[in-house]
């Protein structure tokens, strides 16, 4: 189920790379966030809580990522034109239940000024 395009700035460019921001409600305690490029899973991050409220962060498809209390940022480096595509944040909520999946995304446009190694 595609819930629509992100209603926030999803792509932040810096130093020839891009930070892709995937937001979730700050009351979500346990979840899996996947970054999809088209239909392909590029990255994922799973946050779970164990006994004693110990937090576990796991990734099956690892990218450089950063977790905050209401977002996961995935970082892509060495941008080139092949990175231009639709990117989706696929959020699976485990806690609080009932289980829910939501998909938001947008198109990543690549301009010459954002490439990592421009020809002078």
């Amino acid at each position: 189920e595609i819930n629509g395009s992100a209603n926030y700035e999803m792509f932040i460019f810096h130093n020839g790379g891009v930070q892709i921001l995937c937001k979730y409600p700050d009351i979500v305690q346990q979840f899996k966030m996947q970054l999809l490029k088209g239909g392909q899973i590029l990255c994922d991050l799973t946050k779970t809580k164990g006994s004693g409220n110990t937090v576990s962060i796991k990734s099956l498809k690892f990218c450089h990522s950063q977790l905050s209390n209401n977002s996961v940022s995935f970082f892509l480096y060495n941008l080139d034109h092949s990175h231009a595509n639709y990117y989706f944040c696929n959020l699976s909520i485990f806690d609080p239940p009932p289980f829910k999946v939501t998909l938001t995304g947008g198109y990543l446009h690549i301009y010459e000024s954002q490439l990592c190694c421009q020809l002078k």
């Epitope: 189920e1 819930n3 629509g4 209603n7 937001k23 979730y24 409600p25 700050d26 009351i27 979500v28 209401n70 806690d95 609080p96 239940p97 009932p98 289980f99 829910k100 939501t102 938001t104």
Partner: antibody
Framework: QITLKESGPTLVKPTQTLTLTCTFS??????????VGWIRQPPGKALEWLAF???????RYSPSLKSRLTITKDTSKNQVVLTMTNMDPVDTATYYC?????????WGQGTLVTVSS | DIQMTQSPSSLSASVGDRVTITCRAS??????LAWYQQKPEKAPKSLIY???SLQSGVPSRFSGSGSGTDFTLTISSLQPEDFATYYC?????????FGGGTKVEIK
């Protein structure tokens, strides 16, 4: 501080459509609030869940009432609206809206709706 | 749908008594159960979530236990303000369902 308040008609006639509005404060349905639900309680009876709307506009309904219910939200106004068609005297109840983070942690005061001709 | 069955439907107790209310789910719901207190003409108030976690501001005489299908709400020493109706609710899956309620009355 999270607060919710229901508003709407206190009396509706059979076959009419009921429209209830939940106006809330203390959270945003944009990102930080998981969602808002509606629950009703006929006089002297138990609580019954009706509908729920998530921050991303995903909607869930009680299967037994799904054909009669519509839930919508207006994030900019901090409001959630429930409409219920083809009202019947058995729908006489106090209708509550509530903020949900799994369980319903904050409730409105409720509004009594009587269905009578 | 998951049916929630509360027992007893009503009970009489005195101030200082230990009171236990049970709630049974028709299928396993892990620990995704909440308890609410409702006084006449008032909205329900959240007491317990995740079967045993005390909602902020709720007195410690209230406690919850259980997982799977069988759950218990205990009031360790009943106070005058605790005379009310108590409801359980599962939030493991849709449709969300409530128990039929337990009315705690003064003996």
């Amino acid at each position: 501080q999270i607060t919710l308040k229901e508003s709407g008609p206190t009396l509706v006639k059979p076959t009419q459509t009921l429209t209830l509005t939940c106006t809330f404060s203390g959270f945003s349905l944009g990102t930080s609030g998981l969602g808002v639900g509606w629950i009703r309680q006929p006089p002297g009876k138990a609580l019954e869940w009706l509908a729920f709307i998530y921050w991303d506009d995903d909607k869930r309904y009680s299967p037994s009432l799904k054909s009669r219910l519509t839930i919508t939200k207006d994030t900019s106004k901090n409001q959630v609206v429930l409409t219920m068609t083809n009202m019947d005297p058995v729908d006489t109840a106090t209708y509550y809206c509530a903020h949900r983070r799994g369980f319903f942690d904050y409730w409105g005061q409720g509004t009594l709706v009587t269905v009578s001709s | 749908d998951i049916q929630m069955t509360q027992s007893p439907s009503s009970l009489s107790a005195s101030v200082g008594d230990r009171v236990t209310i049970t709630c049974r789910a028709s299928q396993g719901i892990s620990s995704w159960l909440a308890w609410y207190q409702q006084k006449p003409e008032k909205a329900p108030k959240s007491l317990i979530y995740a079967a045993s976690s005390l909602q902020s501001g709720v007195p410690s005489r209230f406690s919850g236990s259980g997982s799977g299908t069988d759950f218990t709400l205990t009031i360790s020493s009943l106070q005058p303000e605790d005379f009310a109706t108590y409801y359980c609710q599962q939030y493991n899956s849709y449709p969300l369902t409530f128990g039929g309620g337990t009315k705690v009355e003064i003996k």
